[in-house]
């Protein structure tokens, strides 16, 4: 998200790990492998973040911005309802869902979309940056 | 334009069981949950369970556990649902209906199927 | 198991008249709400999702809003082809769970 792009922030933008983009106060990192929802959340946990959580509608057009087609795993479940991994509601847009088997959340370029958890798909990660 | 179209009434004596078809028509099939849903007369809407009809997984809410068992042949592309041990509590009309897009709320419906329980 | 609580059972209104039907959850729900119409002998039919997504084909009369636990429909001009009984529905939480249902009449 740095690098002379239009979310550049200021000249502290090294400020994130190598392979992880800042914007604001949080630095992402998406992957290019594919891991199941489980998975991925445990490869950002290791590495002292959390699979991605929106915050609002502002944030998540941002990142569709740098999003392909290709859906990423986000940390989002239904857990009696969609929720965030933080326990917060998702209250600002709506998931495409088939079915109820689907309980795990992805977001590509153009929406939220529920799949089952199993599946492998590339993910974010998000932490505040240093 | 999904249609679904659903078995003919039935009257069945107390004890017995009986299965109940839903036939969709005019999209895939196996993409969306199918619902079952009850509806006594003069009464309002009860959800017995669902389907998903790419894996056969079902959920059936905890007052029909043990009531209604859901299937699906996706070669007819035809959902069934079996009743068992009846009584006169479960006469009534039974919906099938596909889920909507963005989650279980229901955006096409069948006719109905009405079951009388009698002896 | 949230439960839904629809608090009329029947209204009254006259023909060109405002409806508003009320629905009440028992926890939040954050917009994840159905209603749905029924006419005697026929199946419901979706009128919105999301609380004020308005289905394809529904007329602009009926309108959705609410937020929280609390939910109304509104039928801003009654037509005689309205008189039907209305159910909201949750669909936060599994199970989904429906209203009582409000029955519309002409007053």
């Known amino acids: 998200l740095c690098q002379g792009s239009k979310y550049s922030t200021c000249a502290s933008c090294p400020s994130c790990p190598d392979h992880w983009m800042k914007y604001g106060n949080h630095c992402y990192y998406f992957s290019v492998e594919k891991k199941d929802w489980i998975s991925s959340l445990e490869f950002c946990l290791a590495r002292d973040s959390h699979l991605l959580m929106i915050t609002d509608k502002q944030e998540m057009s941002l990142l569709q911005d740098f999003l392909s087609e290709a859906f990423h795993w986000v940390g989002l479940r239904n857990n009696s309802g969609w929720r965030w991994e933080d326990g917060s509601p998702l209250n600002f847009s709506r998931i495409y869902s088939n079915s109820l088997v689907q309980t795990c959340g992805a977001i590509n370029k153009n929406s939220l979309q529920a799949s089952s958890c199993e599946v492998s798909l590339q993910w974010v990660c998000k932490k505040v940056s240093p | 334009q999904v249609h679904l179209q659903q078995s003919g009434p039935e009257l069945v004596k107390p004890g017995a069981s009986v299965k109940l078809s839903c036939k969709a028509s005019g999209d895939t099939f196996t993409t969306y949950d199918i619902t079952w849903v009850k509806q006594r007369p003069g009464q309002g809407l009860e959800w017995i369970g669902w389907?998903?009809?790419?894996?056969?997984?079902?959920q059936n809410s905890e007052k029909f556990k043990d009531k209604a068992t859901l299937t699906v042949d996706t070669s007819s592309t035809t959902a069934y649902m079996e009743l068992h041990s009846l009584t006169s509590e479960d006469s009534a009309v039974y919906f099938c209906?596909?889920?909507?897009?963005?989650?279980?709320?229901?955006?096409?419906w069948g006719q109905g199927s009405t079951l009388t329980v009698s002896s | 198991v949230i439960q839904m609580t629809q608090s009329s059972s029947f209204l009254s209104a006259s023909l060109g008249g405002r409806v508003s039907i009320t629905c009440r959850a028992s926890?939040?729900?954050?917009?994840?709400l159905a209603w749905y119409q029924q006419k005697p002998g026929n199946a419901p039919r979706l009128l919105i999702s999301g609380a004020t997504s308005l289905e394809t084909g529904i007329p602009s009369r009926f309108s959705g809003g609410g937020s929280g636990k609390d939910y109304t429909l509104t039928i801003i001009s009654l037509q005689t082809e309205d008189i039907a009984s209305y159910y909201c529905q949750q669909y936060w939480n599994t199970p989904p769970t429906f209203g009582g249902g409000t029955k519309v009449e002409i007053k």
């Open positions: 389907i998903y009809p790419k894996d056969g997984r079902t």
């Open positions: 209906a596909r889920r909507g897009q963005f989650g279980p709320y229901f955006d096409h």
């Open positions: 926890d939040h729900i954050y917009n994840w």
